[in-house]
């Protein structure tokens, strides 16, 4: 039907970004972002700049990285504004009500913009080989760039559900993204998977007055485990529960709790291990006797304030059709995903299995993590 985002990613702060390879004029790109429920992206200092650069660096577009690419962003100089040679943005400004970070912490200009006080001018982000950001470049608004960047702002996000026995996970985000992995999902994201026996399961991230949670998620995992152990959210057998140092690296599945030996799971209330342990001290006890489902908190650092853009997509407001196959010739329906963890977020899986996620604004930074979902 039409192409998905080439790549997209969300930070724990609630900001999501998507990168699109599509030859179009600035006005059409701006409309494309709005129709997706976002806006043409600002690329301010700090976390936002890092998130966008990470998206670009995740891989070349349809050209295979053979040429420089130009991407529309929400940077322009209005008709009545002059070129300012000594300013970092040269008199251009971001189309956003929030002043954001220091404009001095920005990319360089690939070419100095023409001196003018009359004509409106737009600017693009030039990427060498389509992946390495070179800097800003003035461009007439009616010309066509190679692509564009969108930004979406959400108040809350759902942390990724733990798979358990699930396979073939597929995420469908509301702003046109198919992916096999998404650490943080905006409301409206649908996760589908297969449980044992090829039984399909589907859960949706929904926002309510408490926060964001996975609707229809019974228990704390997508598919219950046949056994009693989980490692990194997936079902595991006891022999696979020892880490390199001999420590117990698993947690107990629903209905089980950590035995007294600290390295095996027993039926809740039993108190004695059904599988013997060697008494190796537990380095990371995943559960307590009072909590069969571990209370999990994600301490994630924040680097940007919430509400950076006036647009706050709502899951049932913006509907964009999602294609079966991206037009730009990728071999699967998956897209490369870029995650930047940039906010102090508290996300808790409650005993009922719902996820509560809220954000507290702080000012520290984090290194973006890349997930290539096409090979996941």
């Amino acid at each position: 039907e039409h192409p998905t985002a080439d790549r997209a990613g969300c930070s724990a702060s609630g900001a999501c970004y998507s990168l699109h390879h599509a030859t179009m004029k600035r006005q059409a790109a701006e409309e494309a972002c709005i129709l997706r429920g976002g806006a043409l992206s600002t690329v301010r200092a700090g976390a936002e700049l890092r998130a966008v650069l990470a998206l670009l660096r995740a891989g070349p577009g349809p050209g295979g990285g053979s040429k420089d690419l130009l991407f529309w962003v929400a940077l322009e100089r209005r008709r009545s504004h002059c070129t300012l040679e000594n300013e970092p943005l040269r008199g251009f400004s971001w189309l956003s009500s929030d002043p954001g970070g220091l404009e001095s912490d920005t990319l360089q200009w690939v070419e100095e913009p023409q001196r003018s006080c009359t004509a409106r001018r737009c600017a693009v982000l030039q990427a060498t080989g389509g992946v390495e950001p070179a800097g800003w470049k003035e461009m007439r608004c009616h010309l066509r760039a190679n692509g564009y960047l969108c930004k979406y702002q959400f108040e809350v996000l759902c942390p990724a559900p733990r798979p358990g026995a699930a396979s073939n996970l597929s995420y469908r985000a509301p702003f046109q993204l198919h992916s096999a992995a998404l650490d943080f999902s905006p409301p409206g994201t649908e996760v589908s998977a297969l449980c044992r026996g090829q039984l399909p399961i589907s859960v949706t991230c929904i926002a309510d007055e408490i926060g964001a949670r996975w609707d229809k998620l019974s228990g704390d995992v997508l598919c219950p485990c046949p056994g009693r152990y989980l490692r990194a959210g997936k079902c595991a057998e006891l022999p696979n529960c020892l880490d390199d140092l001999g420590g117990f690296a698993c947690e107990c599945a629903t209905g089980f709790e950590l035995g007294k030996d600290g390295r095996s799971c027993v039926t809740s209330g039993e108190g004695q291990p059904t599988l013997g342990g060697t008494g190796v001290p537990t380095r990371r006890p995943p559960a307590t006797a009072t909590s069969p489902v571990p209370q999990r908190t994600w301490p994630i650092r924040v680097d940007e304030k919430l509400g950076e853009t006036p647009l706050v997509p709502e899951q049932d407001n913006s509907v964009t059709s999602i294609p079966e196959i991206p037009r730009w010739g990728s071999q699967s329906t998956m897209s490369t995903l870029q995650m930047s963890l940039q906010a102090e977020s508290k996300a808790t899986i409650t005993p009922s299995g719902s996820v509560i996620s809220k954000f507290n604004s702080t000012t520290s930074s984090a290194t973006p993590q890349a997930f290539d979902s096409s090979s996941a």
Epitope: E1, H2, P3, A22, T23, M24, K25, Q27, A28, E30, E31, A32, I34, L35, R36, G37, H142, R144, P310, L311, V312, P313, E314, N317, S318, V319, T320, S321, R327
Partner: antibody, heavy 118, light 108 residues
């Protein structure tokens, strides 16, 4: 000059499907979004969705998802909207509109009137 | 979904009279993304005012638009017979695009 020429009046039965066309001229068809708007008799305007002919990117109002399907043929500069599972609620005039450089729907087709009757 | 409420739904004005109609949004809309359309019976809507205050090509100077945030208005400084029509406000600050219910302006 930008012109949008829409296909003629349609009379259809409940449950059937109809496909209407909008032929564009006077501009580069693949460079601008084409929007579709519904207007029931004596009522206001309702946005259905949009298509970008340059890459067939589409976006729909949730209300019309599954009801309307937007397509475009670049070789003839023609946009199409197909309406399925027709009911009396689909009796309306449907407009195609050009989304222009003023960030608004600056040109409109003359409308296609659809009447559903058994 | 942003709901646009137009008032009054119907109004009548004498020739030469000053006319003002309003459009209230359920949540804030950027002034760049608020437009007005004029529609006469049997005709397609026409872009009348774009980005809150800019007159579309061919629109008489007696028309003006203003507003910000959630409150916008269209004003005719001196009503003329050809101004009798229905006026719709429209936003695209957030998808889906929405229209107001319209204000029908009649000659008194």
């Amino acid at each position: 000059e930008v012109q949008l020429q829409q296909s003629g009046t349609v009379l259809a039965r409940p449950g059937a499907s109809v496909k209407m066309s909008c032929k564009a001229s006077g501009y580069t068809f693949t460079s601008y979004w084409m929007h579709w708007v519904k207007q029931r008799p004596g009522q206001g305007l309702e946005w259905i969705g949009a298509i970008y002919p340059g890459n067939s990117d589409t976006s729909y109002n949730q209300k019309f998802k599954g009801k309307a399907k937007l397509t475009a043929v670049t070789s003839t500069s023609t946009a199409y909207m197909e309406l399925s599972s027709l009911t009396n609620e689909d009796s309306a005039v449907f407009y195609c509109t050009h989304y222009g450089s003023d960030y608004a729907m600056d040109y409109w087709g003359q409308g296609t009137s659809v009447t559903i009757s058994s | 979904q942003i709901v646009l409420t137009q008032s009054p739904a119907i109004m009548s004005a004498s020739l030469g009279e000053r006319v003002t109609m309003t459009c209230t949004a359920s949540s804030s809309v950027s002034s760049s993304y608020l437009h007005w359309y004029q529609q006469k019976p049997g005709s397609s809507p026409k872009l009348w005012i774009y980005s809150t205050s800019n007159l579309a090509s061919g629109v008489p100077a007696r028309f003006s638009g203003s507003g910000s945030g959630t409150s916008y208005s269209l004003t005719i400084s001196s009503m003329e017979a050809e101004d009798a029509a229905t006026y719709y406000c429209h936003q695209y600050h957030r998808s889906p695009r929405t229209f107001g219910g319209g204000t029908k302006l009649e000659i008194k």
